[in-house]
């Protein structure tokens, strides 16, 4: 029995619902009395959802999964995963048994966009050209880990004297703090770009230092 799943990972935003697609080709006149369906975590073999003896056996996965009743007899064994969490990321296997048996695995990639970075400056007053300042760029509650880039007002990348740390909170979402140490010129704009590599989403923050006062656009 051929079981079909998408080759590419399913990308789902944290807190939204995801559909893990799985399909088979039923013969004409097929009914659900003939179907055994199991969804499980590929690595641990933990049961996620099942259908057997003509009945949806329900979710074994925190009551957050559901099948598509009107579509099951048509060969659509897809699983709806509600309120996606970081911990859901991984591979799910769809096992279908009628008279024959088949299985296939689909990957779930979880993502969350990063917030617009907030910029802080230390010291933040009485600045003169030639002073060394520390600029901190902070962005919150993203997933997976971010890529952080700094550049000056001319778009020139700033790679030296950058320290970036990322900490996961209790939900598995990352807060990123990137610190740039720089010697001030006469005028200066410093930009931080926080990129989510899965969503290809960029969050921008910048600070412009023009003697006095500073501006945070």
């Amino acid at each position: 029995l051929e079981v079909q799943v998408p080759e590419d990972p399913v990308v789902a935003l944290v807190g939204t619902d995801a559909t893990l697609c799985c399909s088979f080709s039923p013969e004409p006149g097929f009914s659900l009395a003939q179907l055994n369906l199991i969804w499980q975590l590929t690595d641990t073999k933990q049961l996620v959802h099942s259908f057997a003896e003509g009945q949806d056996q329900g979710s074994a996965y925190a009551n957050r999964t559901a099948l598509f009743p009107d579509l099951l007899a048509q060969g659509n064994a897809s699983l709806r995963l509600q309120r996606v969490r970081v911990a859901d990321e991984g591979s799910f296997t769809c096992f279908v048994s009628i008279r024959d048996f088949g299985s296939a695995a689909v990957s779930l990639q979880v993502a969350a966009p990063y917030s617009k970075p907030s910029m802080t400056l230390e010291p933040n007053k009485d600045l003169r050209p030639g002073d060394t300042v520390t600029i901190t760029c902070s962005s919150y509650r993203g997933y997976p880990e971010a890529e952080v880039f700094w550049q000056d007002g001319q778009g020139v990348p700033l790679t030296g004297n950058v320290t970036t740390s990322q900490m996961a909170n209790e939900q598995g979402l990352f807060d990123v703090h990137s610190v740039l140490r720089v010697v001030l010129g006469a005028n200066g704009t410093y930009s931080c770009l926080v990129r989510n590599p899965v969503l290809q989403q960029d969050a921008h923050g910048s600070v412009t230092i023009t003697g006095q006062p500073m501006t945070f656009p």
């Epitope: 004409p28 006149g29 009914s31 009395a33 009743p69 009107d70 579509l71 007899a73 048509q74 060969g75």
Partner: antibody, heavy 117, light 107 residues
Framework: EVQLLESGGGLVQPGGSLRLSCAAS????????MIWVRQAPGKGLEWVSI????????SYAQKFQGRFTISRDNSKNTLYLQMNSLRAEDTAVYYC??????????WGQGTLVTVSS | EIVLTQSPGTLSLSPGERATLSCHAS??????VAWYQQKPGQAPRLLIY???NRATGIPDRFSGSGSGTDFTLTISHLEPEDFAVYYC?????????FGQGTKVEIK
């Protein structure tokens, strides 16, 4: 607005052919199973055919197998029903509907097919 | 194919009364039943799916119950706009089928 609009109905002679269209708007057509249902004058609803989102898997009520063909063009957001060897008893209003996974949740207004000499 | 038999064929009731419509399946179909309402000259409208879940926008005077072979649609308090034909439908088989319908008419 989520909408289905059937067209292509009309008067046709017995033995003739007709192609019905169902234009979808307001939702991602290519993500849904779609069906055709018909209703003869004064009678009940009768399922005709169903297609999966790609159009690669189809199913028919036995009486329509071989005479009717369901197809879709996802680039045009349109569902079709090709009806051949039409008979007087095929006279009916033909509806297309979206299969939402929780019932047939969106229906068109129907198109009348009359088979008569 | 799975045959759905609805009863009664016609139900004559007055506004405000309770309507109980039945649908019997020729074999067990778990809870894979939906109910539709159809008014003259209009397309059907989804009322209930999975035997007991109300579709979006459906008033709570409509309720569904049952599992296996016997299913019921109840309209607790008939409103004038509820007089129509009601169909049950099963998705348990690849070959989808509807019941023949129950007409709810004004007494």
């Amino acid at each position: 607005e989520v909408q289905l609009l059937e067209s292509g109905g009309g008067l046709v002679q017995p033995g003739g052919s007709l192609r019905l269209s169902c234009a979808a708007s307001g939702f991602t057509f290519s993500a849904y199973y779609m069906i055709w249902v018909r209703q003869a004058p004064g009678k009940g609803l009768e399922w005709v055919s169903i297609t999966n989102p790609s159009g690669g898997v189809t199913s028919y009520a036995q009486k329509f197998q071989g005479r009717f063909t369901i197809s879709r063009d996802n680039s045009k957001n349109t569902l079709y029903l090709q009806m051949n060897s039409l008979r007087a008893e095929d006279t009916a209003v033909y509806y297309c509907a979206r299969v939402g996974g929780r019932g047939f949740d969106i229906w068109g207004q129907g198109t009348l097919v009359t088979v008569s000499s | 194919e799975i045959v759905l038999t609805q009863s009664p064929g016609t139900l004559s009731l007055s506004p405000g009364e309770r309507a109980t419509l039945s649908c019997h399946a020729s074999q067990g179909i778990s809870n894979y039943v939906a109910w539709y309402q159809q008014k003259p000259g209009q397309a059907p409208r989804l009322l209930i799916y999975d035997a007991s879940n109300r579709a979006t926008g459906i008033p709570d005077r409509f309720s569904g119950s049952g599992s296996g072979t016997d299913f019921t649609l109840t309209i607790s308090h008939l409103e004038p706009e509820d007089f129509a034909v009601y169909y049950c439908q099963q998705s348990y088989s690849t070959l989808l089928t509807f019941g023949q319908g129950t007409k709810v008419e004004i007494k």
